[in-house]
Amino acid sequence: AFGISGVQKYTRALHDSSITGISPITEYLASLSTYNDQSITFALEDESYEIYVEDLKKDEKKDKVLLSYYESQHPSNESGDGVDGKMLMVTLSPTKDFWLHANNKEHSVELHKCEKPLPDQAFFVLHNMHSNCVSFECKTDPGVFIGVKDNHLALIKVDSSENLCTENILFKLSET
């Protein structure tokens, strides 16, 4: 597993700020876990990075992800005046130059090395829930969220509004 050290956080902040040509509102280094407290970990295997959802052993260090927060116009804005219809999007980077990507064709979540500017597949609309969990909706495919399936991250279509609080698309962010 790999992560970003606390020291790297600030150099990364400078590095990332020009990714989309606009600066992020803020950046936050956090470990990512599921609603059921399983950790999201990242491992190098056969020259590519794999993402796992697993129970960590006692005292095992959690991987960290750099979340960069961007503001964007919400596409269903009726008023068209730019005042209404904002949304908060994040990119998630567990190590330098790699970002989580939505692969909508394969319904998978992958780590890709990226050129700047980042593609839309690397952006996720951030939702925060009353449980103080968050969920990540694909910018490129509204209604599709990062979720947990068979101990891996996958893209999950949330068909009915009632499923927005379903546990497999809820994640916890923690500084520790």
């Epitope: 509102i25 803020t26 936050y28 503001e71 919400h74 269903s76 804005n77 009726e78 008023s79 209404d84 219809g85 904002k86 949304m87 908060l88 609309v125 951030l126 939702h127 925060n128 829930m129 009353h130 103080n132 909706e137 509004s161 009632e162 927005l164 609080c165 500084e175």
Partner: antibody
């Protein structure tokens, strides 16, 4: 233009219930959580709770958990707050307030209703 | 619950003065802090969100700063229409909570 229009002032007796409405227009109602905030005379702002109009999912501040009920009517883009077992200390102006960001609470409340004064007196 | 503490609770100032109001959060809220202005008998108005982003239509004499637990609202040159009560509010986690308010009065 986004507007939140609330129902008129109410006078209630202790022990009664009150239902305040908030009609939204000018945006996609289901996209943004609606919060309810109250302000007692000469006091500060206190969040009662909020509701996700898409799912009907609600959150109540602990102080109001047993007495407040938040509902929505998607067909009329209206949010409702019902407060039961009223007491004199519930005398306050009640506001509905729409979240700034689609899907999240991080940006605070960008649009507010005009407020509904609820007076509880015997 | 995250407690929000504003200071001072009230202040007297003159037109043209620079005014600073602070808000302290009981735990880290990153930049997820909003500031509101409220005049008597009116609803609150959003001034600043995400700690430092000026809401559309708000005069540039208003500015916000801070992250983590400590935040500041500054009015660079107080105008007659700025005499009001100001509230901070955290949006990081539920329940969403407000500061107790700072009343800015005419000296």
């Amino acid at each position: 233009e986004v507007q939140l229009v609330q129902s008129g002032a109410e006078v209630k007796k202790p022990g009664a219930s009150v239902k305040v409405s908030c009609k939204a227009s000018g945006y996609t109602f289901s996209d943004y959580n609606m919060n309810w905030v109250r302000q007692a005379p000469g006091q500060g702002l206190e969040s009662i709770g909020d509701i996700n109009p898409k799912s009907g999912d609600t959150f109540y501040n602990q102080n109001f958990k047993d007495r407040a009920t938040l509902t929505i009517d998607k067909s009329t883009s209206t949010a409702y707050l019902e407060l039961s077992s009223l007491r004199s200390e519930d005398t306050a102006v009640y506001y509905c307030a729409r979240h700034y960001y689609y899907g999240s609470s991080y940006g605070g409340f960008v649009y507010w209703g005009q407020g509904t004064l609820v007076t509880v007196s015997s | 619950d995250i407690q929000m503490t504003q200071s001072p609770s009230s202040l007297s100032a003159s037109v043209g003065d620079r005014v600073t109001i602070t808000c302290h959060a009981s735990q880290n809220i990153n930049v997820w802090l909003s500031w509101y202005q409220q005049k008597p008998g009116k609803n609150p108005k959003l001034l600043i969100y995400a700690a430092s982003k000026l809401h559309t239509g708000v005069p540039s004499r208003f500015s916000g700063s801070g992250s983590g637990t400590d935040f500041t609202l500054t009015i660079s040159s107080l105008q007659p229409e700025d005499f009001a009560t100001y509230y901070c509010q955290q949006g990081q986690s539920y329940p969403l909570t407000f500061g107790q308010g700072t009343k800015v009065e005419i000296k």
